[in-house]
Interface confidence: medium
């Protein structure tokens, strides 16, 4: 229904606290280098109008969108182009073309420095002094270097924060309660960034059609006692939501998510029976629980996917009078009887039951024709199984930062072009599916691995974009989304790559390193690990790891030095004439 | 749950019309895949006619192709099938039955669908 001032309608939906929070979020992810004081004056701005707005719809101005309301609010900034350069030329333009401009301008890869967390006691006494603006930093830190990260679920996030400090902050071991439990929010929070910036990728490069199909696949393997009427209704409002994040339009995106909550929860007999403890939460709680909720059992009864898609007669009919509801149909079935593949699998081999119609609708005799489709899954099905038992093996044998480096060799070799930050990164978080993923049940491991593996390639897709530099990563970054994880698999070493020129400074180590933190020097260390294989891309794994063995020991002796900057300072040419002469 | 009503059935001379009704409650008929089925006597069920969930896609035996129409309305929640031209090979009691969730694929397999009527018959006769 329309309303006579959107900014009062949504004021009046979310609430005060949530309608700042959005806004702030908003602001952040848009100009990214603004402090937290610029975005926190704007905001009650903001806020102030639309309470405006709220006594009086009327009132001028209440009409506009909020695209323009908060496009005008941004543009109002002083030294805009000195900050941010041609993000200014936006403002010459006018909405809608205005917020797309500032979206086309959101960094995945903004240049700022990590987010610190401040020692125990500081952020307690903080927090105690101001919690909202404690939390409105929260929001502000992870949104600027997040610009596409799932508001509503990002005020989940500063809620449980909150919520720990609570806690924590009244223990005499602050530190001690705080750490473990803020650690574990963090490693949470970077998979949800990673995760929705792989459904807006797949929105912004792809249309709404492809992330409609990823959440027929997704809901049909969560609610397998759904009917398809109903997994594409939950489909389609889950698509409109996020499609309004990824769009910017955060009040709407966080006011339909609730209100798919609430049709999920007034709706269980018809979804699932597993929303019951979920539905009991408050809403941002509630809303993070639907979205990770167990599968429900699965129908004993039902048919063999045969039956209705080989084996009927009316197959190319039905494919040719509406082919989307008919694949859309096919994908649901499927999905609900394999809560144990990926959804990029399902979407594979929806894509291959697809072609094959395609193909074979226009042949003689199409059943003949189309009669071995489920066997020619095997292969596309056979692949990932292989990827996950292969990489979770090493896994259990290397631990986690072992598989981190096995990986990072690999992937060097594939991409030696790409910056060895970037790679690093990437391998970093490739390796962590094996803590997060190898020590789930059989039936979980497949698409806990696949969709963390295809989110985080996702990554990697976008920092190249931004400089492109090796054409096996362009290659891979250029195909449908559902193929990207087999595609660089497939990958093998890079044969047009002419190998770096072996440089003393980049294995030159100081003795500042021993006081970094371990995940610090395990960076360090994987940063010369990358730039060996930058060197000699055909190393053997074996030379590799008496190379890194001996600079494991090197630090090791070194950092237990007496005279620490002695020891790096003679001992440290010493390893890179070793390091040189292994891999001759 | 589904829940299918028949009715509309009756003793017909050949080349005689009679149009069938089937009233569905418990969910709505655009939602469901949805088709008529007959059985005469001592024989096997046999599909007539089918129409799919959501795409208004009709699909026929070929005994009854050009002489039957199945339609439906979703304001009424009803299923219909108008005979036309009946022949004394068309006796039989038929029966209303859905697949609810499965749009567009109405298959021709009984087995397939787990909601049914309970049937109204038809004769053709002189």
């Known amino acids: 229904e329309a309303h006579k001032s959107e900014i009062a309608h949504r004021y009046n939906d979310l609430g005060e606290q949530h309608f700042k929070g959005l806004v702030l979020i908003a602001f952040s992810q848009y100009l990214q280098k603004c402090s937290y004081d610029e975005h926190a004056k704007l905001v009650q701005e903001v806020t102030d109008f639309a309470k405006t707005c709220v006594a009086d719809e009327s009132a001028a101005n209440c009409d506009k969108s909020l695209h323009t309301l908060f496009g005008d609010k941004l543009c109002a900034i002083p030294n805009l182009r000195e900050n941010y350069g041609e993000l200014a030329d936006c403002c010459t333009k006018q909405e809608p073309e205005r917020n797309e401009c500032f979206l086309q301008h959101k960094d995945d890869n903004p240049s700022l420095p990590p987010f610190e967390r401040p020692e125990a006691e500081a952020m307690c006494t903080s927090f105690k002094e101001n919690p909202t603006t404690f939390m409105g930093h929260y929001l502000h830190e992870v949104a600027r270097r997040h610009p596409y990260f799932y508001a509503p679920e990002l005020l989940y996030y500063a809620e449980q924060y909150n919520e720990i400090l609570t806690q924590c902050c009244a223990e005499a071991d602050k530190e001690s309660c705080l750490t473990p439990k803020l650690d574990g929010v963090k490693e949470k929070a970077l998979v949800s960034s990673v995760r929705q910036r792989m459904k807006c990728s797949s929105m912004q490069k792809f249309g709404e059609r492809a992330f409609k199909a990823w959440a027929v696949a997704r809901l049909s393997q969560t609610f397998p006692n759904a009917d398809f009427a109903e997994i594409t209704k939950l489909a389609t409002d889950l698509t409109k939501v996020n499609k309004e994040c990824c769009h910017g339009d955060l009040l709407e995106c966080a006011d339909d998510r609730a209100e798919l909550a609430k049709y999920m929860c007034e709706n269980q007999a018809t979804i699932s029976s597993k929303l019951q403890t979920c539905c009991d939460k408050p809403l941002l709680k509630k809303a993070h629980c639907l979205s990770e909720v167990e599968h429900d059992t699965m129908p004993a009864d039902l048919p063999a996917i045969a039956a209705d898609f080989v084996e009927d007669q009316e197959v190319c009919k039905n494919y040719a009078e509406a082919k989307d509801v008919f694949l859309g149909t096919f994908l649901y079935e499927y999905s609900r009887r394999h809560p144990d593949y990926s959804v990029s699998l399902l979407l594979r081999l929806a894509k291959k039951y697809e072609a094959t119609l395609e193909k074979c609708c226009a042949e003689a005799n199409p059943p003949a024709c189309y009669g071995t489709v489920l066997a020619e899954f095997q292969p596309l099905v056979e692949e990932p199984k292989n990827l996950v038992k292969t990489n979770c093996d090493l896994y259990e044998k290397l631990g986690e930062y072992g598989f981190q480096n096995a990986i990072l060799v690999r992937y060097t070799q594939k991409a030696p072009q790409v910056s060895t930050p970037t790679l690093v990164e990437a391998a970093r978080n490739l390796g962590r599916v094996g803590t997060k993923c190898c020590t789930l049940p059989e039936d979980q491991r497949l698409p806990c691995v696949e969709d963390y593996l295809s989110a985080i390639l996702n990554r990697v897709c976008l920092l190249h974009e931004k400089t492109p530099v090796s054409e096996h990563v362009t290659k891979c970054c250029s195909g449908s989304l559902v193929e990207r994880r087999p595609c660089f698999s497939a990958l093998t070493v890079d044969e047009t790559y002419v190998p770096k020129e072996f440089k003393a400074e980049t294995f030159t180590f100081h003795s500042d390193i021993c006081t970094l933190p371990e995940k610090e020097k395990q960076i360090k260390k994987q940063t010369a690990l990358a730039e060996l294989v930058k060197h000699k891309p055909k190393a053997t794994a074996e030379q590799l790891k008496t190379v890194m063995d001996d600079f494991a020991q090197f630090l090791d002796t070194c950092c237990k030095a007496a005279d620490k900057d002695t020891c790096f300072s003679t001992e440290g040419p010493n390893l890179v004439t070793r390091c040189k002469d292994a891999l001759a | 749950e589904v829940q299918l009503l028949e009715s509309g059935g009756g003793l017909v001379q050949p080349g005689g019309s009679l149009r069938l009704s089937c009233a569905a409650s418990g969910r709505y008929i655009d939602e469901t895949a949805v088709a008529w089925f007959r059985q005469a006597p001592g024989k096997g069920r046999e599909f007539v006619a089918g129409?799919?969930?959501?795409?208004?896609?009709?699909y026929y035996a070929d005994s009854v192709k050009g002489r039957f129409t199945i339609s439906r309305d979703n304001s009424k929640n009803t299923l219909y099938l108008q005979m036309n031209s009946l022949r004394p090979e068309d006796t039989a009691v038929y029966y209303c039955?859905?697949?609810?969730?499965?749009?567009?694929?109405?298959?021709?397999?009984?087995?397939?669908?787990?909601?049914w009527g309970q049937g109204t018959l038809v004769t053709v006769s002189s």
């Open positions: 129409i799919g969930g959501g795409v208004d896609i009709t």
């Open positions: 039955a859905a697949r609810p969730g499965r749009p567009l694929i109405t298959s021709k397999v009984a087995d397939l669908y787990p909601y």
